[in-house]
């Protein structure tokens, strides 16, 4: 079997819904010494980057500027050290917002209720559209999705207080092309007052934090390695 | 706004060479990844040859060792140096750039591009 190296890390800088025109940013992390990067795009070569000095560098960034929906889709990444390549990355969905216009949310029975009661959210978008997505602010990898003409509803079920929060709708024209969002409507989930002080709202972690990891390895530590590597020897 | 006009095409014997100019206007210049593409008649617009705002290049199977893209930031200039041309050289070439850019990325895709050229022709027949 042909040899390969292990896949790297693909990861949106920030986020991976990147409003039309402006700059999405894309982190390949591979390995130390991989000569080049490649940035694939619906199974096609998009970019190539060559980090100097390789041997310094674990990943690179690729940059995708003035963001529209012919750039919106799947990416994946590989990298070579020397003629050897690496498998495919995961792939990556990139989405483009803030297309045509912009919907309305709204929560029946209220944006206030009480844990145990049944919540519905309602999207609505005039324009031609048949699908709709509902994301919670800090969790937009989670993203729930519904259709209808104008108007798509969200059943939530009986909420618990682990639903608070601020939530967001889109439409979309299709899975990578995605309206202005909403207004965000914030509920408000009480729940039973001896619980109410030990039920804190479901932590959200926000986007943000999915940035690039990526290292750039410095002498020192190289003479360390080196050193640990000649002390290992010489206690042999 | 970009603009970006090609010059030095025309007709060629196969095996000569041809040097293909790009202009660009703006001061944008030194941070736009370059790039040069090609159509041949009743086929689609295909990659020939890109260089990264840090000269880094990157070139099509097709052209590679018979092709060379260089730029000249002083002069707004990018450049295809094309030699041992054959008869599937044939075809319009276009001037591509992706403003503004960052770091050292060598755009091949097309739709990475934001800027384009008219095309020049180039013509390789004997």
């Known amino acids: 079997p042909k040899q390969t190296l292990p896949k790297p890390i693909i990861r949106a800088e920030s986020t991976y819904m990147v409003p039309k025109e402006k700059q999405a940013t894309l982190c390949c992390q591979g390995s130390y010494g991989a000569v080049e990067y490649q940035l694939h795009f619906e199974g096609s070569l998009f970019a190539v980057e060559r980090p100097k000095p390789p041997e310094r560098i674990n990943g690179v960034k690729f940059h995708i500027p003035d963001m529209n929906s012919r750039k919106a889709g799947r990416y994946s990444c590989i990298y070579r050290v020397g003629e050897l390549w690496s498998e495919r990355s995961d792939l990556l969905d990139l989405v483009v917002t803030e297309m045509y216009d912009t919907p309305t949310l709204s929560v029946h029975p209220g944006p206030e209720v009480t844990s145990g009661e049944k919540v519905t959210f309602y999207c609505r978008l005039d324009t031609a559209t048949s699908m709709f997505l509902l994301l919670k602010e800090g969790r937009s990898r989670d993203v729930q999705r519904s259709y209808g003409k104008v108007q798509a509803e969200f059943p939530m079920g009986p909420v618990t207080t682990a639903h608070r929060g601020s939530y967001r709708c889109f439409g979309s024209y299709n899975n990578y092309a995605w309206s202005f969002p909403s207004e965000p409507v914030k509920l408000l989930v009480t729940g039973d007052i001896e619980n109410t002080s030990l039920a804190p709202t479901d932590p959200t972690f926000p986007d943000s934090w999915d940035t690039c990891l990526l290292t750039r390895e410095t002498g020192l530590q190289k003479d360390l390695a080196l050193w640990d590597h000649t002390a290992q020897n010489l206690l042999r | 706004e970009v603009q970006l006009v090609e010059s030095g095409g025309g007709e060629v014997q196969p095996g000569g060479s041809l040097r293909l100019s790009c202009a660009a206007s703006?001061?944008?210049?030194?941070?736009?990844?370059m790039g040069w593409f090609r159509q041949a008649p009743g086929k689609e617009r295909e990659f020939v040859a890109a260089?990264?705002?840090?000269?880094?290049?990157y070139y099509a199977d097709s052209v590679k060792g018979r092709f060379t893209i260089s730029r000249d930031n002083a002069k707004n200039t990018v450049y295809l140096q094309m030699s041992s041309l054959r008869a599937e050289d044939t075809a319009v070439y276009y001037c591509?750039?992706?403003?503004?850019?960052?770091?050292?990325?060598?755009?091949?895709?097309?739709?990475?591009?934001?800027?384009w050229g008219q095309g020049t022709l180039v013509t390789v027949k004997p």
């Open positions: 591509a750039a992706v403003v503004p850019t960052y770091g050292s990325n060598i755009y091949v895709y097309s739709a990475a591009y934001n800027y």
């Open positions: 703006g001061r944008t210049f030194a941070s736009a990844a």
């Open positions: 260089i990264s705002r840090s000269d880094d290049t």
